[in-house]
């Protein structure tokens, strides 16, 4: 899933403006700071644990940890979703959820995880080793997905204890260039922070109209921005295929859930791409390659785009694509 | 834009049956899952079943097990549904909607009578 | 299955007065895990498909004017138009979103007289 992101440039003060370093000191260091507390990657957990009762079936547990509103969970097996997996259920903030065989009941359990229960017989049934795929769509983060199976040695009905597994994938662009710019704050405020003990707290002055005086700007999302990003489902994906990271996810849910080691599968991908190829979203269509919505109308309470992620699940018809399943 | 655009109306006689289409532009076929809608002349809509293009196990409405059959053709992004056994109550206009029924198609109207 | 129920079935006012419209679910469309109502509402004009005007109880589809509200929750939900327009003339449906399969009410038909 690819969207846009826009992320202005933080200005660095212009040098030998010391005359200014009073304002400078006081507004910019707070910028930052927010900036640094607030900044945190967003992890996507999964958790999967084979029944005792039924040997074929299975219960995934998914959930997102960001502070973003999440438009969109897509769940699915035999690799992530958009890459040869079958998906299993798709569920939106406010459209409901949709699910398909093996899935038995998908539903969401907070506003940030939900839960796929499999069936465990016919040619479709799940296998012991299968990989099964969470991917989330949330505004302002983007697409993640995190895929895991079952540990090889877990017996039925237990499960390891949840362990940090990695995040599989960011689809956002220019996720990276966000962190970079975070970094960047953070190390600044630290630098000037230390400049600021060491010399005399300055003293407040009547604000200058001189051109010269430096303004600190703080970045945040545009509201227009914000509207056209919105997220609305999620999607669980599984398959038959050995998992290669022996990892999991440390905020897991109860002890008995076992963990599912993750596959690492970030596929960097460049702004043009993504822009191009319209993504349907929930009552309109976006101008977001895989899955993120780009929306122009409003948005729900708790989701970005439609259910409101990115250019909206809930957006413009000219960016169309009808809400479904990344 | 995102369009789906259904094939023409049907006559056909009883007993026999029938084979719609649906062909989605403007959007990734197989990131979306398509529905059915049966809409009888003058009355309200009935669900009938949904499929996703990466999953070949639609869902159907009980109602309509037996009579609909969902399928799909990633390569020419055409889902289809098939009416078998029809009867004067399979006169409908039918309709396919993707997602969340947010796109809605053109309707096709299937008429029975002998 | 849940059975949706609208009422009135059909309703006459002038442009310009204010339209309630009911729609009533034999179980509850509130989702508990994250305190969502499911249920959607579609206007269909003379000779064309349903489209899509609210979903999730309260949100406007992109585009729909203003002046359509959703409210309500568990089995009761409302659909208000604050100042009917000659365009608005349509059956509107509303539709349980919460759990398969998805059932549709037998809709409202509003006319403008």
């Known amino acids: 899933m690819r969207t846009e992101a826009q992320v202005p440039a933080l200005q660095p003060p212009e040098p030998g403006l010391e005359g200014a370093m009073g304002h400078r000191t006081l507004v910019l260091p707070w910028v930052l700071l927010t900036l640094c507390v607030t900044a945190g990657t967003p992890e996507v957990w999964v958790q999967v644990r084979m029944e005792a009762t039924e040997l074929s079936s299975f219960t995934i547990r998914c959930g997102f940890l960001g502070s973003g509103s999440i438009s969109l969970v897509t769940v699915s097996w035999g690799g992530p979703n958009g890459a040869g997996g079958t998906t299993l259920a798709v569920l939106h903030p406010e459209r409901g959820i949709r699910q398909w065989a093996p899935a038995r009941q998908a539903r969401w359990e907070t506003q940030s995880s939900i839960s796929l229960i499999l069936e465990g017989s016919g040619a479709s049934s799940p296998c012991a080793n299968t990989t099964f795929c969470c991917k989330f769509a949330s505004f302002p983060e983007g697409s993640w997905e995190a895929c895991g199976s079952l540990p090889p040695s877990s017996d039925p009905g237990l499960s390891a204890p949840p362990t940090p597994a990695p995040i599989l994938r960011a689809d956002l662009a220019g996720i990276l260039g966000v962190s970079g710019v975070l970094l960047f704050g953070c190390v600044y405020l630290l630098h000037l922070l230390r400049r600021h003990k060491h010399r005399p707290a300055p003293r407040l002055q009547p604000s200058r109209t001189s051109p010269q005086a430096p303004r600190a700007r703080a970045w945040a999302p545009s509201q227009a921005s914000q509207a056209a990003l919105h997220v609305p489902y999620a999607t669980i994906n599984t398959s038959c295929r050995p998992a290669t990271l022996d990892t999991a996810h440390p905020h897991g849910g109860p002890s008995w859930w076992a963990s599912l080691p993750t596959h690492a599968a970030h596929r960097p991908q460049g702004p043009a791409a993504w822009a191009s190829t319209p993504i349907p979203a929930r009552g309109s269509f976006v101008s977001v390659e895989n899955g993120l919505y780009a929306q122009a109308g409003e948005r729900p309470p708790h989701t970005g785009p439609g259910l409101t992620l990115f250019p909206d699940p809930r957006g413009p018809r000219a960016m169309e694509g009808p809400l479904g399943v990344r | 834009e995102v369009q789906l655009q259904q094939s023409g109306p049907e006559l056909v006689k009883p007993g026999a049956s029938v084979k719609i289409s649906c062909k989605a532009s403007?959007?990734?076929?197989?990131?979306?899952?398509m529905n059915w809608v049966k809409q009888s002349h003058g009355k309200s809509l009935e669900w009938i079943g949904d499929?996703?293009?990466?999953?070949?196990?639609?869902n159907y409405n009980q109602k309509f097990k037996g009579k609909a059959t969902l399928t799909v053709d990633k390569s020419s992004n055409t889902a289809y549904m098939e009416l078998r056994s029809l009867t004067s109550e399979d006169s409908a206009v039918y309709y396919c909607?993707?997602?969340?029924?947010?796109?809605w198609g053109t309707g096709t109207t299937v008429t029975v009578s002998s | 299955d849940i059975v949706m129920t609208q009422s009135p079935s059909s309703l006459s006012v002038s442009a310009g007065e204010k339209v309630t419209m009911s729609c009533k679910s034999s179980?509850?469309?509130?989702?508990?895990?994250?305190?969502?109502?499911?249920l959607a509402w579609y206007q269909q004009k003379p000779g064309q498909p349903p489209k899509l005007l609210i979903y999730?109880?309260?949100t406007r589809e992109s585009g729909v004017p203003d002046r359509f509200t959703g409210s309500g929750s568990g089995t009761d939900f409302t659909l208000t138009i604050s100042s009917v327009q000659a365009e608005d003339l349509a059956v509107y449906y509303c539709?349980?979103?919460?759990?398969?399969?998805?059932?549709f009410g037998g809709g409202t038909k509003l006319e403008i007289k």
């Open positions: 403007g959007y990734t076929f197989t990131d979306y899952f």
């Open positions: 179980q509850s469309l509130l989702n508990s895990g994250n305190q969502k109502n499911f």
């Open positions: 499929i996703i293009p990466n999953n070949d196990s639609p």
């Open positions: 909607a993707s997602g969340y029924f947010d796109v």
């Open positions: 539709q349980n979103d919460h759990s398969y399969p998805w059932t």
């Open positions: 999730g109880t309260s």
